[in-house]
Amino acid sequence: SPVPFGPEGRLEDKLHKPKATQTEVKPSVRFNLRTSKDPEHEGCYLSVGHSQPLEDCSFNMTAKTFFIIHGWTMSGIFENWLHKLVSALHTREKDANVVVVDWLPLAHQLYTDAVNNTRVVGHSIARMLDWLQEKDDFSLGNVHLIGYSLGAHVAGYAGNFVKGTVGRITGLDPAGPMFEGVDINRRLSPDDADFVDVLHTYTLSFGLSIGIRMPVGHIDIYPNGGDFQPGCGFNDVIGSFAYGTISEMVKCEHERAVHLFVDSLVNQDKPSFAFQCTDSSRFKRGICLSCRKNRCNNIGYNAKKMRKKRNSKMYLKTRAGMPFKVYHYQLKVHMFSYNNSGDTQPTLYITLYGSNADSQNLPLEIVEKIELNATNTFLVYTEEDLGDLLKMRLTWEGVAHSWYNLWNEFRNYLSQPSNPSRELYIRRIRVKSGETQRKVTFCTQDPTKSSISPGQELWFHKCQDGWKMKNKTSPFVNLA
């Protein structure tokens, strides 16, 4: 392995790695202008002070310029996410300059050494940007730095060191170890660009988190709570236990941030929306599906600049693969019990029937516990656009379909052996769509038949309600 570079010493010493066998001094950071979507096309290497490659490779001074910054590497070769991202940027922004920052010599080290090298690499990018700014028509406002993992903090340093302010930095699951909780000058922060948006996909709440948990941008988006990504479970990744390791699962969750960003570039017709919320638990309870006061936003490339916000945590659910978009619904369900069923924690499912499609049987996730004689809020989501909701079916699972449900049933029985007739009354369900912000109320057809017990189902149809009438327009007309 190459010799690690420490954080000390002159910048010039750190950017060059002399070798006895070398006839010329090579920089440790290269800027590869990708002139084609084709990964086999070698592109052009740009270097500070050399204008000829800019002309030879048709660098467009007035266009957007993307700098893609990779992270720590154990292989010393670019992973496939980079190829996908380059291709997606070329597809979406045909005239843009796409530059891959190759700092492999400084990233293919022990993790701690690679971390110590991030500052130097950030400095190198800043020097390149300062030089480009000397050219006519080049604007720092058109620069978008996209950093993955350790590369996100490199982007932060670059934004910090450059003369002026770069237009945007996107942090794709910024690295956690050695950055969590540190001073803003030593990690990505909202001060590093005019707009800093961040996707967090692998922020474990226990132990060592590969991705940074804390918010570090103007908006910080935590898909699926920022931890367990659908399609990245042990069985999903490995397919069969014979092939694969925990590292594949880690890669899947960490790299998901990149794929969500790629999705936002190539699936413009299916933009994913995130909703501001104080924490993941509240979001899972369906409390945070509001778009008032800029509380929702597109994710990835299409995110709307929100300079007034700092460290604004936003959440969304996604599918397991591209396109990642899902449709979020908030359900407000008033549950009443005459016989005071105490600890009854029913296993409930809802099926939504819409003008375009019907949903699957969706579980109502009980985040804390169901409050009886009170309104409970739930979050459900569908992979398909159901259109206008027409009716819904609520089911209380009777037979235990899992060990967890069996335990629940047993616990319920122990707590109330003398009261086997567990019964809930639900007269109406209020539904709000996150994507359209429309609110609709559903009632039982016969108000006298609003009870449900284990193994039973209850049907709800659209009904008049004051809530529904308040809001008829979609706030996403100008967002999409």
């Epitope: 190459p2 090579k26 990964p39 070698e42 292989s75 010393g76 070769i77 492999l104 010599p105 490995i238």
Partner: antibody, heavy 120, light 107 residues
């Protein structure tokens, strides 16, 4: 024209070491990676590892971690693979191949192969 | 490691025939599948990259297709120089792995 010229056949005794060379021409040596592949007699191909000539960074298949050492000499655009503690299991044809900068890049040009025979 | 399986180890065909060689991966390899030709003298050449992209200088009678875990190489209108061994290789995950090869011989 891209070319990878490998060193000639080797006949060695068990326990010995050997250094196979692969001289690149027709392209900028530091813009691609060099990979080594083993083909045992009448068998499939096995990836041994690669080296990035730009800075000398290497990555080996776990199976060959203690067997192969990869190096480059940028001044002569030559890549080397040293195989140590040779046994009859190491008898095979060894190829060097050029690859682009991504995992997904194919091995677009191959050397002619170096036959290694290990026999007492 | 990802296992690459070429179920047909040997295939006989005549000049002018159309043949298809298949390759299966033990998990989804996202179309990062390359095909190589090895001649009896040991010479190895790239034919197709990224499932279907023809390498420069390779005749158009060679084509590739597939997705997920299943891929194939088709040679239409076989010519004498096509009789060789064909290997598939995945570029999705380290370590890079190859199929066991399919030897195409003259009938």
């Amino acid at each position: 024209e891209v070319q990878l010229q490998q060193s000639g056949p080797e006949l060695l005794k068990p326990g010995a070491s050997v250094k196979i060379s692969c001289k690149a021409s027709g392209y900028t040596f530091t813009d691609n990676t060099i990979h080594w592949v083993k083909q045992s007699h009448g068998k499939s191909l096995e990836w041994i590892g690669h080296i990035n000539p730009y800075y000398g960074g290497t990555n080996n298949n776990e199976k060959f971690k203690d067997k192969a050492t990869l190096t480059v000499d940028k001044s002569s655009s030559t890549a080397y693979m040293e195989l140590r503690s040779l046994t009859s299991e190491d008898s095979a044809i060894y190829y060097c191949a050029r690859k682009g900068i991504y995992y997904s890049s194919p091995f677009d040009y191959w050397g002619q192969g170096t036959t290694l025979t290990v026999s007492s | 490691d990802i296992q690459m399986t070429q179920t047909t180890s040997s295939l006989s065909a005549s000049l002018g025939d159309r043949v298809t060689i298949s390759c299966r991966a033990s998990q989804d390899i996202n179309n990062y599948l390359n095909w190589y030709q090895q001649k009896p003298d040991g010479t190895v050449k790239l034919l197709i990259s990224y499932t279907s992209k023809l390498h420069s200088g390779v005749p158009s009678r060679f084509s590739g297709s597939g997705s997920g875990t299943d891929y194939s190489l088709t040679i239409s209108n076989l010519e004498r120089e096509d009789f060789a061994t064909y290997f598939c290789q995945q570029g999705n995950t380290l370590p890079f792995t190859f199929g066991s090869g399919t030897n195409l011989e003259i009938k």
